[in-house]
């Protein structure tokens, strides 16, 4: 379970009105789902039972976006339509480049998604926690233009921060 | 590198409408938003709109109602419709591709050569 560095960009509106960018870093996990791959791309946030639909008409991206998923507690959902593993691949199905779950009102996701699959996704699926979810769904909630990006080494520091 | 094409630009009277379009060439995998900036004489260029590639939208306050954005991710082509054109929207509008450089943390654009709008009243 190698740790999951991700950095997510916020594009938001400064006073001008043009973009400007805020930049976080948190770590996550790569579970055994998936991938121990680097991917970027845009977040999509997706509900957990957004993920139940099978309809093949539904809007397929047409490009690499990274899906994040805040999983619920269990009690909430006694009878998933998905194992968390099946909502992984429908989301990779989708068009995922990879996937972001929170797992901090749901820990037992963790061995789910750690349970050695003989056919991983090709996708990274990591999971976050903590402070490092917190963080994550902050960025998430305000429903602006983000992008995420996973390695599983560490980003190289920049010795300046710059803003648009 | 990426090479952006605009079309659409014209004179027109107020009240009226035009379509500006943008086609994206080169490595668009980086086109993480496309925009569209305008220029008046005089003063400085400004956003007018963007759309990421999810489709979220920023617009300009001036051009709220009247101006929409859109895009076509898998012909790399970004659009404005401008309707209710005013005399004030007359500009050079530029079409705008930004994206992050993660290595130096920091946003660039690349641009686009400009087309005029003229709103006579």
């Known amino acids: 379970k190698e740790t999951a560095f991700v950095e997510v960009v916020l594009f938001e509106s400064s006073p001008s009105g043009d973009y400007t960018t805020y930049t976080t870093g948190l770590t996550g996990r790569f579970s055994r789902a998936g991938a121990t791959l680097s991917a970027e791309g845009e977040i999509v946030q997706m509900h957990p039972l957004g993920l139940c639909n099978n309809n093949d008409e539904e809007d397929l991206y047409e490009y690499g976006w990274v899906g994040v998923v805040k999983l619920e507690q269990p009690e909430l959902d006694p009878k998933p339509c998905l194992t968390v593993l099946g909502k992984a691949k429908r989301a990779v199905q989708r068009g995922a480049t990879a996937v972001i779950f929170d797992v901090s009102e749901n820990p037992e996701a963790i061995d789910q998604l750690n349970q050695g699959s003989e056919d991983p996704l090709k996708r990274p699926v990591v999971y976050v926690k903590g402070a490092d979810a917190i963080k994550l769904m902050n960025i998430v909630n305000k429903q602006k233009v983000a992008r995420a990006r996973i390695q599983h080494r560490p980003p190289r520091q920049p010795t300046e921060y710059f803003d648009m | 590198q990426v090479q952006l094409q605009e079309s659409g630009g014209g004179l027109v009277q107020a009240g009226g409408s035009l379509r500006l379009s943008c086609a994206a060439s080169g490595t668009i995998s980086y086109a993480h938003i496309m925009g569209w900036y305008r220029q008046a004489p005089g003063k400085e260029r400004e956003l007018v709109a963007g759309?990421?590639?999810?489709?979220?939208?920023n617009y300009a306050d001036s051009v709220k109602g009247r101006f929409t954005i859109s895009r076509d991710n898998a012909k790399n082509t970004v659009y404005l419709q401008m309707n209710s054109l005013k005399p004030e929207d007359t500009a050079v509008y530029y079409c705008?591709?930004?994206?992050?450089?993660?290595?130096?943390?920091?946003?660039?654009?690349?641009w686009g050569q400009g087309t005029q709008v003229t709103v006579s009243s």
């Open positions: 705008a591709v930004i994206s992050y450089d993660y290595i130096k943390s920091v946003p660039f654009r690349y």
């Open positions: 759309i990421s590639q999810g489709s979220i939208t």
